[in-house]
């Protein structure tokens, strides 16, 4: 067994990772009083326990179960917003529409958003040099397994009408290989979810095409329909105006199509 540090293809653990996770947990409990029963030290210990001393290509959902249990949170199941390749706008939306939630508005999503982490087999060290890349190295790495686990649970919790924001500027507006396409779509519960409503966000100022007719959207509709869930789709031609109208719905310019 080589004793030198394994070199992976992806960036290493985010600097100040333990401090950041702990600080984020405390911040979250400060601004979400209903989560003040959470013991942030235990949360960090469970997070650490999921990947420390384990081979970073051999992580399982089971490894994250203690963390999942500590981070259990009830969000209104009919107020869930999924997103794919358009995170910033989705977060701007829930920041204004306070009764809707993305995964990153929950404790576990908030803790891990934009962070990278991994350990090394048989040592208690965190690897700040490199971590496995999903494509080039392995899919069962700490970060990918974490997001797969929390995304599955989030989708499973959804009910009634579930919304998803999709990036209309991408070549594949719906991508089967994204977390939304590979995990969330398949874990929506048909006995609870009536409709998946896609919001296709346009990028270009002059783009007046109906992107709901895009072949990848038709593919999404087909997958969803086969799961006995209704599908609907809306074009959001002007994302800036869309956000403005969510903020000020009584504005006279907000009656026209956005």
């Amino acid at each position: 067994v080589p004793r030198w540090r394994q070199q992976w293809s992806g960036p290493g653990t985010t600097k100040r990772f333990p401090e950041t996770v702990l600080a984020r947990c405390v911040k979250y409990t400060e601004i979400h009083p209903e989560m003040r029963h959470v013991d942030c030290q235990s949360v960090w210990d469970a997070f650490k326990g999921a990947f420390i001393s384990k081979h970073p290509c051999n992580i399982t959902e089971e490894d994250y179960q203690p963390l999942m249990k500590l981070g259990t949170q009830t969000v209104p199941c009919n107020k869930i917003l999924l997103w794919s390749r358009i995170k910033d706008l989705a977060h701007q939306f829930t920041q204004v529409q306070r009764d809707m939630f993305t995964l990153e508005d929950t404790l576990l999503g908030y803790l891990a958003d934009d962070l990278t982490w991994c350990g090394e087999f048989n040592t208690s060290k965190i690897n700040y040099q490199s971590c496995p890349d999903w494509r080039k190295d392995c899919s069962n790495n700490p970060v990918s397994v974490f997001w797969k686990t929390v995304s599955r649970r989030f989708a499973e919790a959804a009910c009634d009408v579930v919304h998803v924001m999709l990036n209309g500027s991408r070549s594949k507006i719906f991508d089967k290989n994204s977390t939304f396409g590979s995990v969330e779509v398949h874990n929506l519960q048909p006995e609870k979810v009536q409709t998946l409503e896609a919001w296709v966000i346009h990028g270009g100022r002059e783009d007046s095409r109906d992107l709901c007719q895009d072949p990848t959207i038709k593919e999404l509709e087909s997958i969803i329909s086969k799961r006995n869930i209704q599908f609907s789709c809306k074009n959001i031609y002007r994302p800036d105006k869309f956000l403005q109208c969510v903020k000020n719905p009584e504005d006279s310019s907000c009656t026209s199509e956005i």
């Epitope: 401090e19 950041t20 405390v26 911040k27 400060e30 009083p33």
Partner: antibody, heavy 123, light 112 residues
Framework: EVQLVQSGAEVKKPGATVKISCKVS????????MHWVQQAPGKGLEWMGW????????DYAEKFQGRVTITADTSTDTAYMELSSLRSEDTAVYYC????????????????WGQGTLVTVSS | DIVMTQTPLSLSVTPGQPASISCQSS???????????LNWYLQKPGQPPQLLIY???TRAAGVPDRFSGSGSGTDFTLKISRVEAEDVGVYYC?????????FGQGTKLEIK
């Protein structure tokens, strides 16, 4: 040592906008929520809102909603509070404030305060 | 919003004597985590408020032990066992159980 240092006093005309800064030192800016509190002369304390400097997310008291904007610049470790459409009732001292963390739990009390910024609204 | 009501609004105390300030909340401030989210502050003239007590009864760092907080879910008391000249100012209670955090109207303490 934790310090919150606010910008100087301002005199504004009704209808104008004021922007107050709060520069922090002695801790990692993004690790804590920053709150803003208003104190009108001879009156009590009124919470205005908070910002999470790391994400830029905010929440405001209903009373100030639509007129207040709290922002943060992580490159300079500075939080800002902007109040628009000023009226005479906005004449007050404005404070930035932060909680202490007691063994990985937010205390729920504002343990650190800026020195305050007096804003006078007068025609 | 939770309403905080303080009594009395002012009091005058002889140095070395005890003082007591009451605060009542319109809802219980006891969280399911067992903590009561009630804070006490002292604001001295020309200064920002300083935290004295958090979680109803825990003294903040550097606060003398003559200050103590007690109470139940909705009725709270700040006691100063022996008032000193430096204790003059306005005392505020505050709830931080939920947003928006709200303050009492303040109690002015002066020395006789």
């Amino acid at each position: 040592e934790v310090q919150l240092v606010q910008s100087g006093a301002e005199v504004k005309k009704p209808g104008a906008t004021v922007k107050i800064s709060c520069k922090v030192s002695g801790y990692t800016f993004t690790d804590y929520i920053m709150h803003w509190v208003q104190q009108a002369p001879g009156k009590g304390l009124e919470w205005m809102g908070w910002i999470d400097p790391e994400y830029g997310s905010t929440d405001y008291a209903e009373k100030f909603q639509g007129r207040v904007t709290i922002t943060a610049d992580t490159s300079t470790d500075t939080a800002y509070m902007e109040l628009s459409s000023l009226r005479s009732e906005d004449t007050a001292v404005y404070y930035c404030a932060r909680v202490a963390i007691i063994t990985t739990v937010a205390s729920g009390g504002f343990a650190y305060w800026g020195q305050g910024t007096l804003v006078t609204v007068s025609s | 919003d939770i309403v905080m009501t303080q009594t009395p609004l002012s009091l005058s105390v002889t140095p070395g004597q005890p003082a007591s300030i009451s605060c009542q909340s319109s809802e219980s401030l006891l969280h399911s985590n067992g903590k009561t989210y009630l804070n006490w502050y002292l604001q001295k003239p020309g200064q920002p408020p300083q935290l004295l007590i958090y979680w109803m009864s825990t003294r903040a760092a550097g606060v003398p032990d003559r200050f103590s907080g007690s109470g139940s879910g909705t009725d709270f008391t700040l006691k100063i066992s022996r008032v000193e000249a430096e204790d003059v100012g306005v005392y505020y209670c505050q709830q931080f159980l939920e947003y928006p955090p709200t303050f009492g109207q303040g109690t002015k303490l002066e020395i006789k």
